[in-house]
């Protein structure tokens, strides 16, 4: 039995920040779970982890240097990524694991979300006229 995950196919991070919502076919509110976000086609980089236990506060952390926060809905986890770099444009996959009560459950691999990071564009400086000719 696998949990199904839905993600937006593509998101654009205009201000180097983005909200990525992972929607699950599963109620997480009465479970101990570990939701994570992975970068790359091979999911090699674990970007952010949200650890939840129905009776305690959410734990949100990144061991890979990403600036992230997380929010829990009853069937979703939203990852808020900030300070993204243009070169972190990639495909990102949501993963969910239900640790307790047993049995352990995880998800079918989702289609992922391409996050396109557009760097902050500085406002172009006004064009000054050249020096006046004598």
């Amino acid at each position: 039995n696998k949990i199904l995950v839905k993600q937006s196919p593509m998101l654009v991070a205009y201000d180097n920040a983005v909200n990525l919502s992972c929607k699950y076919s599963y109620n997480l509110f009465s479970r101990e779970f570990r939701a994570s976000l992975h970068k790359g086609l091979d999911s090699a980089v674990e970007v952010c982890v949200v650890y939840g236990n129905y009776s305690q506060q959410l734990q949100v952390y990144s061991k890979t240097g990403f600036n992230c926060d997380g929010k829990l809905g009853n069937e979703s986890v939203t990852f808020y990524l900030q300070n993204l770099y243009v070169n972190q444009t990639d495909i990102y996959f949501c993963k969910i694991e239900v640790m307790y009560p047993p049995p352990y459950l995880d998800n079918e691999k989702s289609n992922g979300t391409i996050i396109h990071v557009k760097g902050k564009h500085l406002c172009p400086s006004p064009l000054f006229p050249g020096p006046s000719k004598p």
Epitope: N1, S25, N27, S30, N74, P102, P103
Partner: antibody, heavy 121, light 107 residues
Framework: QVQLVQSGAEVKKPGASVKVSCKAS????????IHWVRQAPGQGLEWMGW????????NYAQKFQGRVTMTRDTSISTAYMELSSLRSEDTAVYYC??????????????WGQGTLVTVSS | DIQMTQSPSSLSASVGDRVTITCRTN??????LAWYQQKPGKAPKLLIY???HLVEGVPSRFSGSGSGTDFTLTISSLQPEDFATYYC?????????FGGGTKVEIK
Amino acid sequence: QVQLVQSGAEVKKPGASVKVSCKASGYTFTEYIIHWVRQAPGQGLEWMGWFYPGSNDINYAQKFQGRVTMTRDTSISTAYMELSSLRSEDTAVYYCARRDDFSGYDALPYWGQGTLVTVSS
Amino acid sequence: DIQMTQSPSSLSASVGDRVTITCRTNENIYSNLAWYQQKPGKAPKLLIYAATHLVEGVPSRFSGSGSGTDFTLTISSLQPEDFATYYCQHFWGTPCTFGGGTKVEIK
């Protein structure tokens, strides 16, 4: 189809122990939690605890901690509930029930027929 | 531990009546609640899970509502086979306590 068949009625003396069995069929025994619930004569349902045959994970109600032991024999798909230091207040029908996970919502859709345990001197 | 307060403890009704049973918890359990029907000498039968979801095969005259701390089981038109005792049970952590039960008797 899913079936839980329990052992027969027992009469025990105060201070003794009783071991009730619950034989599962129609599904993979090690993949579902088994709950134990009891009902004293003319009273409501009382939750005793749950047991996961796949890993021996157990969760007992505080009231029964130290007196109840839930075990299993996977080779014969059977769960057991043993209650020790019996007293007259333990006279009840004891039920096993399978917990199903409805996409993260739990419930007990399958129940054994119940085992009457009478504690009397 | 979560306390389950079920009311009324008993009620008398006639065939065709609309019957409402309530279950209140002392803390938010979201929708993690089930309802059961039990007839004398029989094991309980699951009617509703996740507070509002009717189990397959259970007649549509049964319905569940509520979330958080207040829940209701409604029988829209009581039938002769519905005279029984009804229990709620929470699944928000352990112990998975039952309500005290509501006995539905013939008026």
